[in-house]
Interface confidence: low
Amino acid sequence: KNLKSPQKVEVDIIDDNFILRWNRSDESVGNVTFSFDYQKTGMDNWIKLSGCQNITSTKCNFSSLKLNVYEEIKLRIRAEKENTSSWYEVDSFTPFRKAQIGPPEVHLEAEDKAIVIHISPGTKDSVMWALDGLSFTYSLVIWKNSSGVEERIENIYSRHKIYKLSPETTYCLKVKAALLTSWKIGVYSPVHCIKTTVENELPPPENIEVSVQNQNYVLKWDYTYANMTFQVQWLHAFLKRNPGNHLYKWKQIPDCENVKTTQCVFPQNVFQKGIYLLRVQASDGNNTSFWSEEIKFDTEIQAFLLPPVFNIRSLSDSFHIYIGAPKQSGNTPVIQDYPLIYEIIFWENTSNAERKIIEKKTDVTVPNLKPLTVYCVKARAHTMDEKLNKSSVFSDAVCEKTKPGNTSK
């Protein structure tokens, strides 16, 4: 009787694990073994696939084969007993394109109202993801063990902290990886659970904000108690993607060590152009708080999203406002290379009733004004793009009187 070759062959690749599965064509024939060959693109000869020769089951592992994962390969399988079946060729495939991302490794640390999550790829020093290790992002699902109500958090990096949790409460979570540059979404890790600690005596500082004054950054925050000292640390944001990097160390801002107020001022030249994370910690001499939530701080946006400058041309029933680029020290205009939207607030000098105009254009008409009346105007800029999401402070108010009643043209 002629042996039939297996017809349905599946290739599963998870990280660096290459698994083949197939169906027996003829269940009635016993003691059949199976063997695979492979062929690289552009080659004529077939090579025996190590790990997949004379297999008695319907599954084999060829992970030991050192393939170029970006190169297309072809497989063929046959059944063997006394004689052999014809070869069945599997559709050619590129391992990298076919590969799925396996479950990541997850390590948790508990604070009173936060959990720190350390995530690393499931396969250490993976060949498959060697060029993409820093491109992994992760998403997770977290729930209180007692309730089971799930919350999803997308787009997190290798080291992530979840805030606003309850003390002395068990939380469970699972994590999966994504490789957005190749549009791959992985499988979830096993579930990990951890209990948050007893509530700390000192809460962390809150509502951290950075603004620019003259050539300095001003960092402000809120705190519940008086007579405290604070320290501020910074980290390059890109290191969040690569916490294994030896540079992953939070550093002190020299002018913000052991400050007694809820703000500190430091020169702009402390930071080169880039994106940083900042965090603040409080101490009363005996106890220290946990670190505050980290804020993202982009020197380009922070430094250059200055309030707009504007000129007013006064008519009897309106103002024409011409918005120009803000000035740096030295009176040179700042180049804003991202789109802005302008918020213009105006009010009658004798009244507190403010009106607002939002406008993308740099020439704006403020309508419906009364003649011979003093109105004041202030403006600020917002970035239009949600990924930047910044606002300047308001400009100083400029007050002008409208013209008499016949000058509206």
Partner: nanobody, 122 residues
Framework: QVQLQESGGGLVQAGGSLRLSCAAS????????MGWYRQAPGKEREFVAT???????NYADSVKGRFTISRDNAKNTVYLQMNSLKPEDTAVYYC????????????????WGQGTQVTVSS
């Protein structure tokens, strides 16, 4: 906030065709990549097809040769032409868009649509 609006789902006989479309709005940025995933009842969401900024396409093996993804960059819209539909293609189809500044690593973001139901009857 980015909104993704899918349309084109519905009920179709096996062997028939449907064309899904998904328009991204709500930001002046262009999506770096757009694509389709699907979720059948009781199963995980699975990849169907994607197209990136350089118009490189990727397809799941199960839809290769039957489905074609394309995009209109001017309209921030992605399309999925589904031919030779099979009952196993029945699922909720989700549009996805990646907004990514590949130079600034913290600006990756993936957004999902609400989904559109595709039912293929035998």
């Amino acid at each position: 906030q980015v909104q993704l609006q899918e349309s084109g789902g519905g009920l179709v006989q096996a062997g028939g065709s449907l064309r899904l479309s998904c328009a991204a709005s709500g930001t002046i940025s262009k999506p770096w990549g757009m694509g389709w995933y699907r979720q059948a009842p009781g199963k995980e969401r699975e990849f169907v097809a994607t197209i990136d900024g350089g118009s490189t396409t990727n397809y799941a093996d199960s839809v290769k040769g039957r489905f074609t993804i394309s995009r209109d960059n001017a309209k921030n819209t992605v399309y999925l032409q589904m031919n030779s539909l099979k009952p196993e293609d029945t699922a909720v189809y989700y549009c996805a868009a990646v907004y990514a500044d590949l130079d600034v690593v913290l600006y990756y973001h993936i957004y999902w649509g609400q989904g559109t139901q595709v039912t293929v009857s035998s």
